[in-house]
């Protein structure tokens, strides 16, 4: 059997890292058993069989030109075998950051906080971590380890599937290399990373009869729980073409009436979403939808009993009295106020 | 030489922006992370953002975070801050530094100064 | 965020004196500690890392020791070129985090 172990990484291939001794072992031979070495390719001897270092070669101070194969022969002249040395650094800790969109499941994705030059691979796992009663500052022995599974195809991410809500997880991302290994730990809790994706199906159609009006629509984002036991709340901005600021509410439902918009020109609506207790996030903005307010006035129809019945809108005049709409980012004077006139409602 | 050099500090009014650079030589700058470290006059030292060797990775301190924007470009071997929305606050000699394993940082530049200030 | 702390903010000794600083961190940090010295006008200087190992090029005369969440910095003999601020930093989370600093002059 070879006296060399096998560090992992390709067969044959041998590692050390710059400026540091680098010990070559002849694969072949019995250990102990005096060899001679040579560069491939080259007469020059390097290191005889009466170096007293039996089947091992040192490189004193390793630099790249170093770098290559090796053939080590015994004392008959036969071949003990080729060795390749490669040089590169001990891995580092990676580094580490999770999310979730959901409050189910969440993901991990890591990067190498310097590059080792060597072959690499990183093992994944988590535990869970649980509070020891709900005065207990105390953490209880943690549960697990559980592998965190690795995409396929290579990409540096790992899922965590059925994780629970309230509870904190350890996050385990190991890089190894020939020459070592180096351990990043994370501590995430599911309420501080999640972050849903933004909502889908956004629409913006026009109110028939008020120049003034827009209604916004959206869907809960597919990969939020079918069931969700969380509601998401929402967040709406909009804003005229070529208006530079953005006007900001924040919706009951899933739709908003828009009642302060421009009369006659486009207006780009977007909406973002977070879980309605507030954990972790608000959504990226979802694309941008676009609606123009009618231009028409309301029928005069009578309208069927118990129906709502609205006055038609009329442009304000500038000094006219207006309450401001809730905003987080209110518009100039121009859009900051809402219909002069108020709809005011009544049973026919 | 292995060394690193800022660039870009200078005066500039509160609510602007400007953009510092950072050449690296003398070392294989993609294979490292880079960070940026500031020192307000008379002050201590304060991390301020790391990018990890693809870019593939950022870090902000709570303080820049939304306003500042690191970034590198392996081929140039630069490292680069974009800062925006510039506060009196900011006000610092700027320090590009190469860590290692994230956090040690071992090579450091000489500083750009940049003052915020009507 | 770790929040590092250092004493004292400020000491005179006579050369040759032993120095020590203190560094405190507001959890455990394993032993990621590195120990910095600054120059008036010059960047800092890594002395120590990983709590008791010397920089290449650092004189022999300056230490480190400790782990968790207490660490302390020790300059054997302090000498004239000692003068200098110095700083502890942690590394064990994605955000290194700096102590006050402790400003060493001679009496």
């Known amino acids: 059997s070879s006296p060399c172990p096998q560090a992992w990484g390709p067969p044959g291939v041998q590692y050390g890292q710059p400026g540091r001794s680098v010990k070559l072992c002849c694969p072949g031979v019995t250990a102990g058993d005096p060899v001679s070495w040579f560069r491939d390719g080259e007469p020059k001897l390097l290191q005889g069989p009466d170096s007293g270092l039996g089947h091992e070669l040192v490189l004193a101070q390793a630099d790249s030109t170093d770098e290559g194969t090796y053939i080590c022969q015994t004392l008959d002249g036969a071949l003990g075998g080729t060795v390749t040395l490669q040089l590169g650094y001990p891995p580092a800790r990676p580094v580490v950051s999770c999310q979730a969109a959901d409050y189910e499941n969440f993901s991990c994705t890591w990067s190498p906080s310097q590059i080792s030059g060597l072959p690499t691979r990183y093992l994944t796992s988590y535990r869970k971590k649980t509070v020891l009663g709900a005065d207990s500052q105390r953490r209880s022995p943690s549960t697990g380890p559980w592998p965190c599974p690795q995409d396929p195809l290579g990409a540096a991410r790992c899922v965590v599937h059925g994780a629970e809500f309230w509870s904190q997880y350890r996050i385990n991302v190991t890089e190894v290399n020939p020459l070592g290994a180096s351990t990043r730990l994370l501590d995430v809790s599911l309420q501080s990373i999640l972050r849903p994706d933004p909502p889908q199906g956004l629409r913006v159609e026009s109110v028939p009869g008020y120049p003034r009006r827009l209604r916004a629509s959206w869907t809960y984002p597919a990969s939020w729980p079918c069931q969700p036991h969380f509601l998401l709340k929402f967040r709406l901005q909009y804003r005229p073409a070529q208006h530079p600021a953005w006007s900001t509410v924040e919706p009951a439902g899933l739709e908003e009436v828009i009642t302060d918009a421009v009369a006659g020109l486009p207006h780009a609506v977007r909406v973002s979403a977070r879980d309605f207790l507030d954990a972790g996030t608000w959504s990226t903005w979802s694309p941008e939808a676009w609606g123009t307010p009618s231009t028409g006035t309301i029928p005069k129809e009578i309208p069927a009993w118990g129906q709502l019945h609205t006055q038609p809108e009329v442009e304000p005049q500038v000094d006219s009295p207006a309450p401001p709409r809730p905003s987080l980012q209110p518009h100039p004077r121009l859009l900051d106020h809402r219909d002069s006139v108020e709809q005011v409602a009544v049973l026919a | 030489e292995v060394q690193l050099l800022e660039s870009g500090g200078g005066l500039v009014q509160p609510g602007g922006s400007l953009r510092l650079s950072c050449a690296a030589s003398?070392?294989?700058?993609?294979?490292?992370?880079m960070t940026w470290v500031r020192q307000a006059p008379g002050k201590g030292l304060e991390w301020v953002s790391s990018?990890?060797?693809?870019?593939?990775?950022?870090q902000y301190a709570d303080s820049v975070k939304g306003r500042f924007t690191i970034s590198r470009d392996n081929s140039k071997n630069t490292l680069y801050l974009q800062m925006n929305s510039l506060r009196a606050e900011d006000t610092a000699v700027y320090y590009c530094?190469?860590?290692?394993?994230?956090?040690?940082?071992?090579?450091w530049g000489r500083g750009t100064l940049v003052t915020v200030s009507s | 965020d770790i929040q590092m702390t250092q004493s004292p903010s400020s000491l005179s000794a006579s050369v040759g004196d032993r120095v020590t600083i203190t560094c405190q961190a507001s959890?455990?940090?394993?032993?990621?500690l590195n120990w910095y010295q600054q120059k008036p006008g010059k960047a800092p200087k890594l002395l120590i890392y990983?709590?008791?190992n010397l920089q290449t090029g650092v004189p022999s005369r300056f230490s480190g020791s400790g782990s968790g969440t207490d660490f302390t910095f020790t300059i054997s003999s302090l000498q004239p070129e000692d003068i200098a601020t110095y700083y502890c930093?942690?590394?064990?989370?994605?955000?290194?985090?700096f102590g006050p600093g402790t400003k060493v002059d001679i009496k």
């Open positions: 530094a190469k860590p290692l394993d994230w956090g040690r940082f071992d090579l």
């Open positions: 930093q942690q590394y064990d989370n994605l955000s290194p985090t």
């Open positions: 990018i990890v060797p693809s870019g593939g990775h950022t």
């Open positions: 959890q455990d940090i394993n032993n990621y």
């Open positions: 990983d709590a008791s």
């Open positions: 003398g070392f294989t700058f993609s294979w490292y992370s």
